[in-house]
């Protein structure tokens, strides 16, 4: 048993049929010695008396808020949560496996630049009685500070019969140098509590590996005289690290017909313009990627040809 | 500790070209190592990230773009002094800091070159003959060093009398390639910045 936060404790349980329960001794936080009684949750029934209450925690029915009282007055609370371990593996019932980039990916993180700011998100089908708490650091043995905000519900989607909820959190490394060469990964730890179930999820990464630039901005077409060709121009996204001559991007320009089946013409360039043939009803899209370290491509920025 | 914005100089172009080749070569070599050594811990998640140049050179700090010198998190490093002549420099126009930056890059390359050559000698003794260093990568390191053209003491190649542990050598190769790739990215960024300045 360990303390998650004040008056909230996590009991780690081996979750197999013939596992014994965990013996837990609850102590009432009071100088009083006599006349103390214990109740659980909303029930007013007395579960025991005395300054300590020894319980066996085996089921979710044994978890909950234990309260000690004296003469109708509440003295203290202890909320017990359960963390299940099945076949030596901690349960992952609360979050959905996103399976990208590999199986058992519950947390996904992205950074728009090298400033040390990043966003992580996760999915669940649970809509109520759900809380998240996020901590992060650079390295684990001698951790350096990363500050994370509160996790918030960022999207709701319907998937078949199920509703899916996306939560996200923004974090910022306390003292980040965009030009630094990372040798210690960022560690992100999410505590998830659903009703009386506790789970924790972790992700470890280098900022350089989760970079995904914003799409190029100000995408414009300039027709070339007496030609079907157009000059496409764009700019670096505002969110990209500066100076751009140091943090350079490379670009992919794509001409795509109305039909998804039509052949796509693609051009790669380090410049912020390109000359392409604009077909009728086609659209021109441009996306960006770090020129020197191949992490993710940005989403496409698009304009119609006509 | 910063790179001044100078007028463009054609003398920078050869270094930019060589640094691009270097990044391409080390990335290819790392990819090959990952594939060939698929049953070894060779991915970024599996290896320990070690920097053989740590406390010996200060490339990131010495080559910091001017715009980032206002960022205190980028300035917590030590001073290192280097020899200041090199053919990538437009001699009179180049500041002391740029010289320091380029000589730091040169020292990095020299250290990696020695390590890679020593390692290759060991890998050539492996009866499995599983993996060797790409000669192209070694050549590209050499070319960039020549383009930088710093006078520097030659570092003798390390020789070892004991029987090599090939498993450890291959893991060390992965660690070295990952670190060198990260340094090659920094070198490429620096050359691009200097080229645009």
């Amino acid at each position: 048993i360990w303390e998650l936060k004040k008056d909230v404790y996590v009991v780690e349980l081996d979750w197999y049929p013939d596992a014994p329960g965990e013996m837990v001794v609850l102590t009432c936080d009071t100088p009083e010695e006599d006349g103390i009684t214990w109740t659980l949750d909303q029930s007013s029934e007395v579960l025991g008396s005395g300054k300590t209450l020894t319980i066996q925690v085996k089921e979710f029915g044994d978890a909950g808020q234990y309260t000690c009282h004296k003469g109708g007055e509440v003295l203290s609370h202890s909320l017990l949560l359960l963390h299940k371990k099945e076949d030596g593996i901690w349960s992952t019932d609360i979050l959905k496996d996103q399976k990208e980039p590999k199986n058992k990916t519950f947390l996904r993180c992205e950074a728009k630049n090298y400033s040390g700011r990043f966003t992580c998100w996760w999915l669940t089908t649970i809509s109520t009685d759900l809380t998240f708490s996020v901590k992060s650091s650079r390295g684990s043995s001698d951790p350096q500070g990363v500050t994370c905000g509160a996790a918030t519900l960022s999207a709701e989607r319907v998937r078949g019969d199920n509703k899916e909820y996306e939560y996200s959190v923004e974090c910022q490394e306390d003292s980040a140098c965009p030009a630094a060469e990372e040798s210690l990964p960022i560690e992100v730890m999410v505590d998830a509590v659903h009703k009386l179930k506790y789970e924790n999820y972790t992700s470890s990464f280098f900022i350089r590996d989760i970079i995904k630039p914003d799409p190029p901005k100000n995408l414009q077409l300039k027709p070339l005289k007496n030609s079907r060709q157009v000059e496409v121009s764009w700019e670096y996204p505002d969110t990209w690290s500066t100076p751009h001559s140091y943090f350079s991007l490379t670009f992919c320009v794509q001409v795509q017909g109305k039909s998804k089946r039509e052949k796509k013409d693609r051009v790669f360039t380090d410049k912020t313009s390109a000359t392409v043939i604009c077909r009728k009803n086609a659209s021109i899209s441009v996306r960006a990627q770090d020129r020197y370290y191949s992490s993710s491509w940005s989403e496409w920025a698009s304009v119609p040809c006509s | 500790r910063n790179l001044p914005v100078a007028t463009p100089d054609p003398g920078m172009f050869p270094c930019l070209h060589h640094s691009q080749n270097l990044l391409r070569a080390v990335s290819n070599m790392l990819q090959k190592a990952r594939q060939t050594l698929e049953f070894y811990p060779c991915t970024s998640e599996e290896i320990d990230h070690e920097d053989i140049t740590k406390d010996k050179t200060s490339t990131v700090e010495a080559c910091l773009p001017l715009e980032l010198t206002k960022n205190e998190s980028c300035l917590n490093s030590r001073e290192t002094s280097f020899i200041t002549n090199g053919s990538c420099l437009a001699s009179r126009k180049t500041s002391f800091m740029m010289a320091l930056c380029l000589s730091s890059i040169y020292e990095d390359l020299k250290m990696y070159q020695v390590e890679f050559k020593t390692m290759n000698a060991k890998l050539l003794m492996d009866p499995k003959r599983q993996i060797f260093l790409d000669q192209n990568m070694l050549a590209v390191i050499d070319e960039l060093m020549q383009a930088l053209n710093f006078n520097s003491e030659t570092v003798p190649q390390k020789s070892s009398l004991e029987e090599p542990d090939f498993y450890k050598t291959k893991i060390k190769l992965c660690i070295l390639l990952h670190a060198f790739r990260i340094r090659a990215v920094t070198i490429d960024r620096v050359m691009s910045y200097l080229n645009a300045s």
């Epitope: 014994p20 659980l40 949750d41 979710f60 029915g61 | -």
Partner: antibody, heavy 119, light 107 residues
Framework: EVQLVQSGAEVKKPGESLKISCQSS????????IGWVRQMPGQGLEWIGI????????RYNPMFRGQVTMSVDKSSSTAYLQWSSLKASDTAMYYC????????????WGQGTMVTVSS | EIVLTQSPATLSASPGERATISCRAS??????LAWYQQKPGQAPRSLIY???NLQSGIPARFSGSGSGTDFTLTISSLEPEDFAVYYC?????????FGQGTRLEIK
């Protein structure tokens, strides 16, 4: 006052289905799991299983798994035990009981439902 | 599963006497053992939990002791209403199991 009131005695033929009930009152129904115990004529007590009234989480005795089904209706504070196809060997007194949280034993019992299966 | 063996199977005693019933487990159940009393035609009633804790409303003449594999239920001075069948139950490991019962009868 805590009370567990069970449905009346049943006489059934082999192969028939049956659902007996246990209605709780006088306490916070969702705080306490409900269990079932079998007592064959002239025999001792046998633990069938327990279930959570919150999310219908169930722990069956392997000996009874597939033979009986436990269920619960939170809105009426009622627990059920059912059979899809009765056998003569199911003849017994069935007790529902309230599981004490933080312990696991049964602190309050229903009066029992006698189930007789005979052709 | 854990087997609980009660002894004796039948205990003959007179009102006012001390009665002791034993319950032995096939493996340790820590202190997670309960005792129940069942009278003819009635449902069982909880007497003792966690080996030695008296259930609310049960007379103090009933007491329990033991831990691990050996447990004892003691009735310090028998009253006429105490003659019944007594069962021990372990609730440490699933499936929870009962002893076969001890019949306490009037001598």
């Amino acid at each position: 006052e805590v009370q567990l009131v069970q449905s009346g005695a049943e006489v059934k033929k082999p192969g028939e289905s049956l659902k007996i009930s246990c209605q709780s009152s006088g306490y916070s129904f969702t705080t306490y799991w409900i269990g079932w115990v079998r007592q064959m004529p002239g025999q001792g007590l046998e633990w069938i299983g327990i279930m959570s009234p919150v999310d219908s989480d169930i722990r069956y005795n392997p000996m009874f798994r597939g033979q009986v089904t436990m269920s619960v209706d939170k809105s009426s504070s009622t627990a059920y035990l059912q059979w899809s196809s009765l056998k003569a060997s199911d003849t017994a007194m069935y007790y529902c009981a309230r599981r004490r949280p933080g312990q696991g034993y049964f602190d309050f019992w229903g009066q029992g439902t006698m189930v007789t299966v005979s052709s | 599963e854990i087997v609980l063996t009660q002894s004796p199977a039948t205990l003959s005693a007179s009102p006012g006497e001390r009665a002791t019933i034993s319950c032995r487990a096939s493996q340790s159940v820590s202190s997670w053992l309960a005792w129940y009393q069942q009278k003819p035609g009635q449902a069982p009633r909880s007497l003792i939990y966690a080996a030695s804790n008296l259930q609310s409303g049960i007379p103090a003449r009933f007491s329990g002791s033991g831990s691990g594999t050996d447990f004892t239920l003691t009735i310090s001075s028998l009253e006429p209403e105490d003659f019944a069948v007594y069962y021990c139950q372990q609730y440490n490991i699933y499936p929870f199991t009962f002893g076969q019962g001890t019949r306490l009868e009037i001598k």
